[in-house]
């Protein structure tokens, strides 16, 4: 008799792939543009990234530090009208991209939550949730919740409103905290909350703490669905040197949970390489003309256009990983088992029932190392085969699709491998 298939878990749309944050419409579109109508024209690009949701804004009216002049129900006219927003929603829906609206109230001001008028602001948020849910948004994001007094109880209330409308609606909270205990206390009081934090940004510029941070987090959160990012808003390049970007992309797409990226992460957008650009929201480099301030500052391989034409680029890697993440059961909701492989190496398996399985080996070291895969660390349900097929490497030069002997697996400096192998009874 064939073994019984394992029952599939309930999957919400945000479980099926990455979220893509566009916190600054003007920086994203560039060239003095930056409105909802223009963003609609970029939805095909988002489709090409295979992302499942767009985290947008904030785009509401907000006079810096003035609670009376902050209206969460009104779109700032600089970004467009309610009609523009409705049109964007419709277009996004047609392309199966969900829209999450950021309602962080005082986004232009000093304290995101007008600390002296918390109750007033909380009421405004409540009204806004109901209003925008009726308008058809798929979820909400609120950031800087470490500045919100009694954040846990407010989040629980907002979560009730969101889920009360539909189980298919999402609430994301963001915090600058990297403290695991603080993060856990926020999660404990809010069952389905998706939380973005600076937790992984403590992994160090060499990535030396990544493995322990990830495993600690997963052990602490148990079966709870998590999200993976390095911060609540900033670019990966704010935290990582160039040589770790590919490793982190591979890791974020293959850990159990929802990967969350900021616009530009897919091309390695780096504010430090663009003099005069703000660290938190540099201009998106669509092509070499996107940053005309300093002629020659932008080369083709830094842009969407240039990287789209290069199969070995960071953007091409992002697209491939995003595609795998959204269609393979083992990556969608599979079990996760980390195991020893050697100094500087982080290796883990993702597997679901009798589906194809995935082995990830990440070399955070700046040296070529043989991976001593300690299969004895793994449960019987997740045993390693003698060989696995190379699906992709973060570095060019390997023959993809070829079987690799796991006993003789050697990684280049800062190389990550994604390997696949079939279930064996």
């Amino acid at each position: 008799r064939a073994p019984r298939c394992r029952e599939l878990p309930a999957q919400k749309w945000w479980h099926t792939g990455a979220l893509y944050r566009i916190g600054d419409l003007q920086a994203f579109q560039g060239h003095g543009a930056g409105n909802l109508a223009g963003l609609k024209g970029r939805l095909d690009y988002l489709s090409s990234l295979k992302v499942k949701g767009l985290v947008l804004g904030p785009i509401h009216k907000n006079q810096k530090d003035d609670v009376a002049q902050t209206d969460l129900l009104q779109i700032d006219p600089n970004f467009g009208s309610k009609e523009d927003f409705d049109s964007l929603l419709q277009s996004a829906k047609k392309k199966s991209i969900r829209v999450i609206l950021d309602l962080t109230p005082n986004y232009r001001g000093e304290n995101s939550w007008f600390s002296t008028q918390v109750d007033t602001v909380a009421t405004k948020v409540k009204d806004a949730l109901e209003f925008w849910l009726q308008a058809g948004v798929d979820g909400f994001q609120v950031r800087d919740i470490e500045n919100l007094k009694d954040a846990s109880s407010f989040l629980a209330e907002w979560q009730n409103i969101t889920k009360g409308f539909s189980e298919d609606r999402l609430l994301i909270a963001g915090t600058n905290s990297s403290d695991l205990q603080q993060i856990l206390s926020l999660l404990e009081s809010n069952k389905d909350l998706l939380l973005t934090s600076s937790y992984l940004s403590d992994s160090g510029s060499t990535g030396e703490h990544t493995k322990s941070l990830v495993t600690q987090y997963l052990n602490a959160t148990g079966n709870r669905w998590c999200s993976w990012s390095l911060s609540q808003a900033r670019l990966l390049t704010s935290f990582l040197p160039a040589q770790l970007l590919r490793l982190y992309q591979l890791m974020l797409f293959t850990l159990p949970g929802t990967p969350v990226f900021s616009y530009g992460d897919e091309i390695g957008l780096d504010a430090a390489a663009l003099p005069g650009q703000p660290m938190e929201a540099p201009v998106m480099l669509w092509d070499e003309s996107s940053f005309p301030d300093i002629p020659g500052a932008v080369s083709a391989n830094m842009t969407v256009k240039g990287q789209s034409e290069d199969p070995g680029s960071l953007l091409s890697l992002f697209r491939r990983l995003s595609d795998q993440r959204s269609k393979e059961r083992s990556l969608l909701h599979g079990d996760f088992h980390a195991f020893s492989a050697g100094p500087g190496l982080f290796s883990y398996i993702r597997h679901w029932d009798q589906n194809e399985r995935f082995l990830v080996v990440l070399n955070f070291g700046d040296v070529g190392l043989s991976a001593g895969l300690q299969a004895s660390d793994l449960p019987a349900s997740a045993s390693l085969p003698a060989k696995a097929d190379l699906l992709l490497s973060t570095q060019p030069g390997r023959e993809e699709g070829s079987p690799l002997e796991l006993e003789r697996l050697k990684l280049e400096p800062h190389e990550g491998l994604l390997l696949r192998f079939p279930y064996a009874a």
Partner: antibody, heavy 119, light 113 residues
Framework: QVQLQQPGAELVRPGASVKLSCKAS????????MNWVRQRPGQGLEWIGL????????HYNQMFKDRATLTVDKSSSTAYMQLSSLTSADPAVYYC????????????WGQGTTLTVSS | DIVMTQSPSSLAMSVGQKVTMSCKSS????????????LAWYQQKPGQSPKLLVY???TRESGVPDRFIGSGSGTDFTLTINTVQAEDLADYFC?????????FGGGTKLEIK
Amino acid sequence: QVQLQQPGAELVRPGASVKLSCKASGYTFTSYWMNWVRQRPGQGLEWIGLIDPSDSETHYNQMFKDRATLTVDKSSSTAYMQLSSLTSADPAVYYCARASYGKGYFDYWGQGTTLTVSS
Amino acid sequence: DIVMTQSPSSLAMSVGQKVTMSCKSSQSLLNNINQKNYLAWYQQKPGQSPKLLVYFASTRESGVPDRFIGSGSGTDFTLTINTVQAEDLADYFCQQHYSSPFTFGGGTKLEIK
């Protein structure tokens, strides 16, 4: 300042084992890799292996894989190398050497332990 | 394993002269991703442990006098000592730090005339 302290000498019998120590001070022990290198009389340098003190993950030169065992004691910031089945080919100066996380070059070295194998 | 070959095995120079020594690797030490060459140079004075001089082929370790200059790429590397001093009497070893097992050259012994 960074220091790696090793005993000056060890005398052991052929076929026996020896456990060499390397006490680190002046830096965060768990933030750097510890390597072991040997130098036989009048010869060059041979890399034996490395250990990451943060999680005790090890990596060995295949030539020493079956005979060398690297360990650490985080509480005393001490690294150890045990070498078993000693023969007349093993007398050498054994150095511990620090490397930044993920790097393969060695920025600080101990003074070395002179190992003598004699019956 | 990557084999490292140094030449000459020894050389004698007078104080103030310029010294060059060579190191060759059996395969390229250039990482095409970051365009760095993974080669280090060490100095070992008599009765002492080795001391790091240069890594990534040309990056001088802090505190090392600027008369020590590392150069080269791919498989061919050179350590140059401009205006050699009496205290430079030592053995000099190159080492590849590209890939495990890390391997050293046989050394060049510098004697002062």
